[in-house]
């Protein structure tokens, strides 16, 4: 799978994580920080 950094317009897309662009899948993906979940790492869990 080809990946790259997200475009600058997606700054802030991932609330608590790193935004990755999955080129072949035509979509952005959030790699969440520890303790966060959700499509955009918006949910905190203990």
């Amino acid at each position: 799978v080809s990946i790259t950094k997200c475009n600058s317009d997606m700054n802030g897309y991932c609330l608590h994580g790193q935004c990755i662009y999955l080129v072949d899948m035509s979509q952005n993906y959030c790699r969440c920080e520890v303790g966060y979940t959700g499509v955009r790492c918006e949910h905190f869990y203990l």
């Epitope: 475009n7 802030g12 897309y13 979509q27 499509v39 955009r40």
Partner: antibody
């Protein structure tokens, strides 16, 4: 399956406002950005602006600043684009476009006609 | 705003010809360019994103290349069903469409 269903065609008088809705099904708009694009008859595509429904942040093309308002209601999974002070040059098909989780998934378009 | 200059605005070619369309950005867009095909009365159809990644179901005669500010879209062998208007779109920093290229059969 994922869908963006837009409101029906509108006819407006110059100076009036129009509000076009874009209802999402099959996905949560909070996971995406919703863009708005328009196309006047026989003309090219023109990006107007976008909203991040989760944060409520909006960005607009400079030429539309102050005249366009993009909003989202996450409880109904619907985005809206309101354009005010309409003039004949605003006659166009208006599209909502999902981006973020999937690259550029388009609604069917809404024709807005501005005529006296 | 980033400007996208697309050329030519129209072209006429024969079936089987190689067709090339270019888009020049006013600043580096880091390969974040997409290409759309639009036929009359239809919504635009995404052909290519991230410069060269073909969408599922799009024929391999369509291709894209480029980097920095200069990008190219190519139809290797023009077919009658390719008659349409083609648009580039930069999506690095907000979004800007090129002016479009109307492709006709000679």
């Amino acid at each position: 399956q994922d869908q963006l269903v837009q409101s029906g065609a509108e006819v407006k008088k110059p100076g009036a406002s129009v509000k076009v809705s874009c209802k999402a099904s099959g996905f949560n708009i909070k996971d995406t950005y919703i863009q708005w694009v328009r196309q006047a008859p026989g003309q090219g595509l023109e990006w107007m602006g976008r909203i991040d429904p989760l944060r409520g942040n909006t960005r607009y093309r400079e030429k539309f600043e102050g005249r366009v308002t993009i909003t989202a209601d996450t409880s109904t999974n619907t985005a809206y684009m309101e354009l005010s002070s309409l003039r004949s040059e605003d006659t166009a098909v208006y599209y909502c476009v999902r981006s973020g989780t999937l690259f550029d998934f388009w609604g069917q378009g809404t024709l807005v006609t501005v005529s006296s | 705003d980033i400007q996208m200059t697309q050329s030519p605005s129209s072209l006429s070619a024969s079936v089987g010809d190689r067709v090339t369309i270019t888009c020049k950005a006013s600043q580096d867009i880091h390969k974040y360019i997409a290409w759309y095909q639009q036929k009359p009365g239809q919504a635009p159809r995404l052909l290519i994103q991230y410069t060269s990644t073909l969408q599922p179901g799009v024929p391999s005669r369509f291709s894209g290349s480029g980097s920095g500010t200069d990008y190219t879209f190519t139809i290797s062998s023009l077919q009658p069903e390719d008659i349409a208007t083609y648009y580039c779109l930069q999506y690095d920093n907000l979004r800007t469409f090129g002016g479009g290229t109307k492709v006709e059969i000679k």
